[in-house]
């Protein structure tokens, strides 16, 4: 018996508006009805929780109102979007999936998505 497998893309480039999206897919060993998804950021030997959501299979993924994350779920796949990113937010974003109910509990952690964020150059003043 091994840890639950979680797959996510190796690299994602955030848009010029500071938005990055990626898919987090997990291989569920059972028929979970309640799943918790957490996005963690590892950078400079620090680990921080970016956002987290618990959802019932078949229902919408709901993050807190002030969360920088949004997402949708489809089967064993979660489509995550992180907004408001700046260059200083570049780092490894890790998808953590926990099958909460029914028992048994399972935990899976992806290998991380390196998100690169490049702050847009300010537009030069124009006389036109």
């Amino acid at each position: 018996c091994k840890a639950m497998h979680v797959a996510q893309p190796a690299v994602v480039l955030a848009s010029s508006r500071g938005i990055a999206s990626f898919v987090c897919e997990y291989a569920s060993p059972g028929k979970a009805t309640e799943v918790r998804v957490t996005v963690l950021r590892q950078a400079d030997s620090q680990v921080t929780e970016v956002c987290a959501a618990t959802y019932m299979m078949g229902n919408e993924l709901t993050f807190l109102d002030d969360s920088i994350c949004t997402g949708t779920s489809s089967g064993n796949q979660v489509n995550l979007t992180i907004q408001g990113l700046r260059a200083m937010d570049t780092g490894l974003y890790i998808c953590k999936v926990e099958l909460m109910y029914p028992p048994p509990y399972y935990l899976g952690i992806g290998n991380g998505t390196q998100i690169y964020v490049i702050d847009p150059e300010p537009c030069p003043d124009s006389d036109f």
């Epitope: 018996c1 091994k2 957490t38 963690l40 590892q42 890790i94 509990y105 935990l107 991380g112």
Partner: nanobody
């Protein structure tokens, strides 16, 4: 799936020793990092130590006093606690995390990466 059960807590005098055990069932320990964490009354859960196949890592507050070890054949992880102090009084938890290539010595013990938490065992250091 992994199931963890810890044991070995109790009351000990300052300067004394205690050994905590964490037994795993349902899976081999090999693909996991096993960590010990503690929570004192009114405080958050903090890292004590963790161990994977080849590395160990300790919180600064326990370095030189606590030793973590694992016996894969018995599916056991141990925390040997020596020179105990009053500030070591807490509920101690064992937890597991899938071992990942991006873990560093500084991050492999981070509580965010862990699951399969045990119920906790009370360690009280008092005279």
């Amino acid at each position: 799936e992994v199931q963890l059960v810890e044991s070995g807590g109790g009351l000990v005098q300052p300067g004394g020793s205690l050994r905590l055990s964490c037994a795993a069932s349902g899976s081999t320990l090999d693909p996991f990092v096993i960590g010990w964490f503690r929570q004192a009354p009114g405080k958050g859960r903090e890292t004590v130590a963790c161990i994977n196949r080849s590395r160990t890592s300790y919180a600064d507050s326990v370095k030189g006093r606590f030793t973590i070890s694992r016996d894969n054949a018995k599916n056991m992880v141990y925390l040997q606690m020596n020179s105990l102090r009053a500030e070591d009084t807490a509920v101690y938890y064992c937890a597991a995390s899938p071992d990942k290539p991006f873990y560093t010595d500084q991050t492999m013990c981070n509580k965010h990466y862990y699951g399969y938490w045990t119920q906790g065992t009370q360690v009280t250091v008092s005279s």
